[in-house]
């Protein structure tokens, strides 16, 4: 089995607890992989304001994960 690594995770630190819904352009979920041993929720902000990592344990992240999974499966 490949060793799980933290070194290539996209998120640095634990992530913010919430992002204003009005500021969200899109949400991406990165599932644990060879590169990173944790789930990452990355929010792309509107108006070219970049991206933010959302704390995957936060209420907002859990809602987004649920919504995305419902859409995909």
């Amino acid at each position: 089995f490949p060793m799980f690594k933290r070194g290539r995770c996209l998120c640095i630190g634990p992530g913010v607890k919430a992002v204003k819904v009005a500021d969200i352009e899109k949400a991406s979920i990165m599932y644990p992989s060879n590169n990173c041993d944790k789930i990452e929720v990355i929010i792309t902000l509107k108006e070219n304001k970049g991206q933010r990592c959302l704390n995957p344990k936060s209420k907002q992240a859990r809602l987004i994960i649920k919504k995305v999974e419902r859409k995909n499966f």
């Epitope: 996209l10 630190g13 634990p14 607890k17 933010r52 704390n55």
Partner: nanobody, 129 residues
């Protein structure tokens, strides 16, 4: 939200040293990604240095090429303070220096000012030649 207050700026001769401090209050400091940026009139904020929590009670750091080997970023979690030790200062280091904090920084955008949520008011550093 974290409140940040910088101090330690001033006037120094080329070749001299300064240590900037950034005192944080109102949030979890340990896991904050702490960045230093600088700005000169009419220009965008320029990345200087960043230090982030690796999740293993240790920190990693990254520096702009222009300051590598001269500047060192560090922190004292007990004091909720980040530092920027600046040695061998050059005339071109003259700028207003800002510290920034973020919990949700994406690695790809670590050098981008828009990645940080909270900012200090800035401290002026002037290097005379």
């Amino acid at each position: 939200e974290v409140q940040l207050v910088e101090s330690g700026g001033g006037l120094v001769q080329a070749g001299g040293s300064l240590r900037l401090s950034c005192a944080a209050s109102g949030g979890t400091f340990t896991k904050q990604t702490m960045g230093w940026f600088r700005q000169t009139p009419g220009k965008d904020r320029e990345f200087v240095a960043v230090q982030w929590w690796t999740g293993l009670s240790t920190y990693s750091a990254e520096y702009a090429d222009s300051v590598k080997g001269r500047f060192t970023i560090s922190r004292d979690n007990a004091k909720n303070t980040a530092y920027l030790q600046m040695n061998s200062l050059k005339f071109e280091d003259t700028a207003v220096y800002y510290c920034a904090a973020g919990l949700g920084v994406v690695r790809t955008f670590i050098r981008r000012a828009s990645s940080y949520d909270d900012w200090g008011q800035g401290t002026q550093v002037t290097v005379s030649s």
